[in-house]
Interface confidence: low
């Protein structure tokens, strides 16, 4: 199991017994747009634009969803596309709230297993490759509404039912209450209210800030872990460099964490995981010898 | 601490719209769904409706003609009318926070307010 | 919509362990969680075993859950049965437009 495979890597263990984000509107600049005698102005912002394909990205990812994961097959796409389009058609950009995203948290209602949810910071790749892997394990994309809207961007006009395909509000140079950044900070919240038992993370030990407390994981997940329902937070520190044994466990940041998780009364264990290439390879094939002794 | 509780008349007639209002504390009916459940002598839980951190509503298919629920976000406070009551709505009637993502589930309930119906 | 039918009683004698099935009607059991709520005369429910099996902290060990596909049903196990165990308790779960449905539930009496 999964802990042979953290015995074969030297893994280190330590037993371990809400900052808001800046809120700010950019107004954006207004640029003309089109030609002839009257132009028509579009809100310029400072992020990259609407995803090429927005509507039929997200309606083709729904379908092959609901095709893999025979559990959602009653959700009906057409009426979650509707729902997501809802949620930014026509209003502005600076202005989303989570209220304008509930009919579509209303569709996208799943059931994962709460005591296998794995959160991520800042090393996405690894931790969809650890769940494809370990497929009883499930992070935020693994659900459907994070399958939909994983590396996508999207917004649109005030008064208008276009899609701005030109620019969208960046978070910290233009508004944080934008059409992404509204969505993640939704479905983080619910999707760590509903963990329970041991909640994993995986941390990317190669950043300054191990633990961001700007992050999604935490500024809000952190926050919304229920505390008479989740028992553990395990922190997984991945290491970048090849030669790197240092114990990332004792990072101060780390040791933040420790402290944020402490005071709601969930208890703290961090692991260090030296070698990514190694874990993913033995939680593939954990018969394999080198994952069940010592290396 | 998180706090439920119901408050209305206890004792209405056949035929009156029965108002109910569900005061919550210690967390934000934007960020929790709402539910209505009624218990009537002598039977098991009732759910009656819910409404969304977004303001929508869903109600029991059963009572969804009699029912209305609203509610005000500035005061905390999650609204029941049931119009052209009977005898057999005589019961309790609570109010309980869920949330969901993957399961719904109360985690908290109001201590229910008793009513009854009489002809 | 599925129903959920549980038995109208159940009795056990103090420090035995006892059983209540929550039987659901149709479509899979492990389809969309079951929640288990405790309810003491002239209380609200509380709830002991939510996402099948897992139990709030402030509730004791002696409360388990659990599905059986076979039987498509969840179970609720209270071993070491205690005088305070007397109550009703109702299971729960939802449809797939989320719709909340409990079954009828079962009177335990210790004996």
């Known amino acids: 199991g999964l802990n042979d495979i953290f015995e074969a890597q030297k893994i280190e263990w330590h037993e371990g017994s809400h900052h808001h984000h800046h809120h700010h509107h950019g107004s954006g600049s207004l640029v003309p747009r089109g030609s002839g005698s009257v132009p028509r102005w579009r809100q310029q912002w400072s992020g990259p634009g609407t995803t090429k394909r927005f509507p039929e990205t997200v309606l083709a990812r729904c379908v092959k969803y609901t095709e893999i994961h025979p559990e959602m097959r009653h959700v009906d796409c057409q009426s979650v596309w509707d729902a997501f389009k809802g949620a930014f058609i026509s209003k502005h950009p600076c202005n989303i709230t989570e209220e304008d995203y509930q009919p579509l948290m209303k569709l996208g209602t799943q059931t994962v297993p709460c005591n296998k949810i794995l959160l991520w910071s800042r090393i996405k790749d690894l931790a969809h490759q650890f769940t494809q892997v370990q497929r009883d394990m499930f992070t935020l994309e693994d659900t459907l509404l994070g399958y939909l809207a994983d590396d996508l961007t999207w917004c649109g006009e005030f008064n208008t039912s276009k899609i701005n395909y030109q620019s969208c509000p960046d978070w910290r140079k233009d508004c944080s209450n934008n059409p992404v950044s509204v969505f993640w900070k939704t479905v983080s919240r619910r999707f760590a209210e509903a963990a329970c038992d041991v909640v994993h993370v995986m941390l990317n030990g190669s950043r300054s800030k191990i633990f961001d407390k700007n992050s999604t994981f935490g500024s809000v997940e952190v926050h919304n872990l229920q505390p008479e329902k989740v028992q553990t937070l395990e922190a997984w520190v991945i290491h970048g460099g090849r030669e790197d044994s240092r114990d990332l466990c004792q990072d101060p940041t780390i040791k933040e964490l420790e402290s944020i998780i402490s005071k709601r009364n969930i208890q703290f264990s961090c692991k260090n995981i030296y070698r990514p290439d190694k874990f993913l390879q033995c939680v593939k094939n954990p018969e394999d010898s080198s994952c069940t002794s010592e290396i | 601490q998180v706090q439920l509780k119901e408050s209305g008349p206890g004792l209405l007639l056949s035929s009156e719209t029965l108002s109910l209002t569900c005061t919550v504390s210690?967390?934000?009916?934007?960020?929790?769904?709402v539910s209505w459940v009624r218990q009537l002598p002598g039977r098991g839980l009732e759910w009656m409706g819910r409404?969304?951190?977004?303001?929508?509503?869903d109600y029991n298919s059963d009572l969804k003609s009699r029912l209305s629920i609203s509610r005000d976000i500035a005061k905390s406070q999650v609204f029941l009318k049931m119009s052209n009551l009977k005898t057999e709505d005589t019961g309790t009637y609570y109010c309980?926070?869920?949330?969901?993502?993957?399961?719904?589930?109360?985690?908290?309930w109001g201590p229910g307010t008793m009513v009854t119906v009489s002809s | 919509q599925f129903t959920l039918t549980q038995p109208k009683s159940v009795s056990g004698s103090l420090r035995s362990t006892i059983t209540i099935p929550c039987e659901r009607s149709s479509g899979d059991i492990g389809d969309n969680y079951v929640t288990w709520y405790q309810q003491h005369l002239g209380r609200p429910p509380l709830n002991v075993i939510y996402a099948d099996d897992q139990r709030p902290s402030e509730v004791s060990d002696r409360f388990s859950g659990s599905i059986d596909s076979s039987s498509n049903s969840a179970s609720l196990t209270i071993t070491n049965l205690q005088m305070d165990d007397e109550a009703d308790y109702f299971c729960q779960s939802y449809d797939s437009n989320t719709d909340i449905i409990f079954g009828g539930g079962t009177k335990v009496t210790v004996l």
């Open positions: 309980a926070r869920a949330y969901g993502f993957n399961y719904w589930s109360f985690d908290f």
């Open positions: 210690g967390f934000s009916l934007t960020s929790y769904e």
């Open positions: 409404v969304w951190i977004g303001g929508d509503t």
